[in-house]
């Protein structure tokens, strides 16, 4: 299988100069890093930072949103060392986690106001915050937290270079005063659980203090990474040894300790993926280990199965897993040795951006009941990373992407198999964004970010689909790239579409081109399946190219015809002639099958020999439905682009156009009178149908109505009849 | 940059009373909540008294209530603790601190800043 590329679709969108100065202020002293990331939340925002300065910017034009610059109490400025998306009582804004001399300062800004509206002391060097929860108090929204943590109005988990892990109260139920950084409040940390959480809580506060309950004491090993998982109502957190624990927050205990394959290498992210329908109350957890840009050169990817007692759906809809039974490595992926042929020595391979997508069935589609707990049919991960190699002055740059339902579909392999690349595995998808880098360089990239909305495996080529479809290698999608000079936006197409697109591209020599693309189509699985156990060499050039067409129509890839036609009519040449007779038979007789097609699915419809039409048969007579637009469309581009036809040619041509158009609405109705409960007919003419489309009596009344107001306008002169 | 300067320190008898001052610089104390601490001789720091922002509130370490009075003056910018009725225990060195990070029982695992420090010395 060919590489999969990475398009970029927009020019450089540069941050504005004013962000570009304040970032740039601070990059001379040596402690200060250019961090950015996008923010993980719906509001489409990336924060970059650099030293005591903070820029927010819009994730889409690279606009400038909010800025500020920390001051500290210290003679060196503080250092923002953590930023996390938050939003609470309608505001939206962030946690920020500042590095001084002497601890570490929390801050709540509000994005609104371009301000600090909280700040607390933290002991140590924060190196990682997550919201846990952005409200308070013992309601049902909290149930799923420990006793002790309801009391307080907001935690965020806090963890620092020492190990410390600490849960903070972040009175959000008292925010009658603005304070900024320098006015931060004191902090009391309690470690275990006192059982008059309110009591001391009320006492901390009006001493000007926030209360915090300490996880773990400090151990002398750095926290890496830090995530809560909503639906399983876990703390993950990584160590720099290559631990990884996962902490319960209902019971406030750690359920799980354990040291990941690659050994003492950092725990630099977690995400977390769930599978659609696992009847053993299972999901997922990968833990990347990365030594970044320090010594050594690893970067792995593990996966973790976590297998729970219960699954739940709550009032608020969201799913709850409880009752770990147990945690157990399923897969690794080793990113820097050779998993993958790359030419040369690698040097140094860093993770850029890990991120998990779900896409939920719409309600008209599930069988579930309401009530159900759903999962995602949907469910892939993201991960993006840089390889430098020696020698070489450009990075190169991945995408990969895990799809876990094809995962578990290849009998959830522990690894790749011997001789299995990355990019012809079944699960899992690679993408070269070398022309990111190309058009980019030599801005450092800080991270990627797909789109989820975008995400998408485009029009079957056929009923069932072929196995080829549900690859992940099929996904289209677009993604933006956080540079340190502003944003760019790239697409990621699948096998099939980028296949359609050579095709597309081939153009006038596409006589060439058959056996390339006919091969192309039929491994990326655009063709039919009676062709998938035939020898392309046993097909002559005429059957390869009905079999592309077939292919452009069923996916709706009209614009390859179309091209093709054009073309043909306005550069003659040798060929031009028998391909445009060709591809014009082709497209009648194919009308004249789907038509036949659609007439056979339809019998049951009028002979009253049944009640109801099976989703199988609707969805077959909407793809007949579907062909017919799309021949439509071709014969519509022969009429309106023939010339030097004779008189006979061009009846014939505009007779074929209104026959299929003609077709194509009589199809449509059809749908309709189905759709509407008014088709399949029934033999028993007063069988009540379950619902009309149209109200009588409000039309009736309607009418009346009108009637009345004519005759009294025209004074008895107007004649209804 | 925030400085603390305390000054007042000496050595007394028991009973006696002292009065210490901690000037600030870079920072204002009508807008911070502050705090006296203290390290007896071989101890961690302890927290002695806070005086909130707007000069309200005023609390106090069990060992030193009814006792110690920790007050400020907006317009010197400058914090005081009166200790009245000294016990040899109380002898440390007596800092005034900003942005206190401590467990339940008082003890303070960190400071964000403060000065460096007058003793106080309570004879016998």
């Known amino acids: 299988m060919r590489d999969l590329r990475a398009q970029v679709t927009s020019g450089l969108l540069p941050f504005p100069e004013v962000t570009l100065q304040a970032l740039g202020e601070d990059e001379i002293t040596l402690e200060s890093v250019l961090r950015g990331k996008f923010a993980a939340g719906k509001n489409g925002l990336a924060c970059l930072a650099c030293g005591p300065q903070l820029e927010v910017v819009n994730s889409i034009t690279g606009e400038r949103l909010s800025a500020y610059r920390f001051s500290g109490v210290n003679e060196q400025p503080p250092v923002v060392l953590a930023v996390k998306e938050f939003s609470w009582q309608k505001r939206t804004g962030l946690l920020i986690g500042l590095e001084e001399t002497e601890g570490s300062v929390l801050c709540l800004y509000d994005l609104g106001i371009s301000k600090v509206v909280k700040a607390v002391v933290l002991p140590g060097r924060v190196t990682a915050i997550e919201p846990i929860i952005n409200h308070g108090g013992a309601s049902a929204s909290t149930q799923h937290l420990h006793p002790s943590l309801r009391w307080l109005f907001g935690v965020a988990a806090v963890v620092t270079d020492v190990g410390q892990i600490l849960l903070v109260d972040l009175c959000l139920d008292d925010l009658s005063c603005n304070q900024n950084e320098v006015e931060a409040s004191d902090l009391e940390v309690l470690t275990g659980i006192p059982a008059e959480v309110p009591h001391i809580r009320e006492s901390v506060m009006r001493q000007g203090r926030h209360l915090c309950f300490q996880l773990v004491s400090p151990t002398g090993t750095a926290v890496s990474t830090l995530s809560y998982i909503s639906r399983t109502n876990q703390l993950a957190v990584g160590f720099s040894d290559g631990y990884l624990a996962l902490w319960n927050m209902k019971s406030m205990k750690r359920e799980y300790y354990i040291q990941l394959e690659s050994g003492q290498v950092p725990v630099y992210a977690v995400t977390f993926q769930e599978p659609e329908n696992d009847p053993r109350n299972c999901c997922y957890l990968w833990a990347v280990q990365s030594t970044q840009d320090s010594e050594g050169d690893v970067l792995s990817l593990h996966l973790l199965q976590l297998a729970f007692g219960n699954r739940k759906c709550l009032a608020s809809g969201q799913i709850l897993y409880e009752g770990l039974e147990y945690c157990e490595e399923r897969y690794t992926l080793d990113l820097t040795g050779g998993m993958f042929p790359l030419r040369g020595q690698t040097s140094n391979t860093k993770l850029l951006g890990c991120q998990s997508i779900e896409k939920f069935r719409s309600h008209g589609d599930r069988e579930e009941g309401v009530n159900e707990a759903l999962s995602p049919d949907t469910s892939v991960s993201v991960f993006t990373w840089q390889v430098n190699i020696y020698g070489q002055g450009k990075p190169s740059v991945y995408l990969g992407l895990f799809d876990i339902n094809r995962w578990y579909h290849a009998q959830m392999p522990d690894s790749l198999r011997s001789g299995e690349y990355l990019h012809n595995c079944s699960y899992f998808a690679l993408w070269s964004l070398e022309s990111v880098v190309s058009r980019t360089s030599p801005h450092g990239i800080l991270d990627i970010l797909v789109h989820e909305r975008s995400l998408n495996r485009g029009v079957p080529p056929s009923y069932p689909p072929p196995e080829q479809f549900f690859n992940p290698s099929t996904y289209n999608f677009d993604a933006t790239c956080l540079l340190n000079s502003g944003v760019v936006h790239l697409t990621c197409t699948g096998f099939q579409k980028e296949t359609l697109t050579f095709l597309k591209k081939s153009g006038p020599s596409l006589n060439e081109l058959i056996p390339d693309g006919y091969n192309r189509c039929l491994v990326a699985g655009l063709l039919s399946p009676r062709f998938v156990d035939v020898q392309p060499s046993s097909l002559s050039q005429e059957e390869q190219l009905e079999a592309i067409l077939s292919a452009a129509i069923q996916t709706s890839s009209l614009g390859l015809l179309t091209g093709y036609i054009r073309r043909w009519i306005t550069e003659e040449q040798p060929n031009s002639a028998t391909n445009l007779r060709f591809v014009l038979e082709w497209t009648w007789n194919k009308v004249v099958l789907t038509k036949e097609e659609f007439d056979r699915l339809c019998v049951p419809l009028f002979d009253g020999s049944c009640h109801f039409m099976d989703p199988q048969t609707i969805q077959s007579i909407q793809q007949c439905y579907l062909l017919l637009s799309n021949l439509n469309i071709v014969l519509s581009c022969f009429a309106s682009e023939a010339r030097e036809i004779t008189e006979r040619g061009l009846i014939d041509l505009s007779n074929k156009f209104v026959v299929s158009h003609l077709i194509c609405q009589y199809a449509q109705v059809v749908l309709w009178f189905s759709h509407s409960g008014l088709l399949p007919e029934g033999i028993d003419d007063s069988v009540q149908l379950s619902r009309l489309c149209y109200n009588y009596p409000v039309i009736q009344n309607y009418y009346t109505s009108r009637r009345q107001k004519f005759e009294r306008l025209s004074r008895g002169k107007w004649n209804p009849d | 940059q925030v400085q603390l300067v305390e000054s007042g320190g000496g050595l007394v008898h028991t009973g006696d009373s002292l009065r210490l001052s901690c000037a600030a610089s870079?920072?204002?104390?009508?807008?911070?909540?502050i705090s006296w601490i203290r390290q007896p001789p071989g101890r961690g720091l302890e927290w002695v008294a806070k005086i909130l922002a707007d000069g309200t509130g005023a609390f106090y370490a069990d060992f030193v209530k009814g006792r110690f009075t920790i007050s400020k003056d907006s317009t010197k910018n400058t914090l005081y603790l009166q200790m009245d009725n000294l016990d040899a225990e109380d002898t440390a060195m007596y800092y005034c601190a900003l942005g206190l990070v401590q467990d339940s029982q008082g003890l303070v695992l960190s400071s964000r800043a403060r000065g460096q420090g007058t003793q106080v010395t309570v004879s016998s």
């Open positions: 870079g920072l204002d104390l009508s807008r911070v909540g």
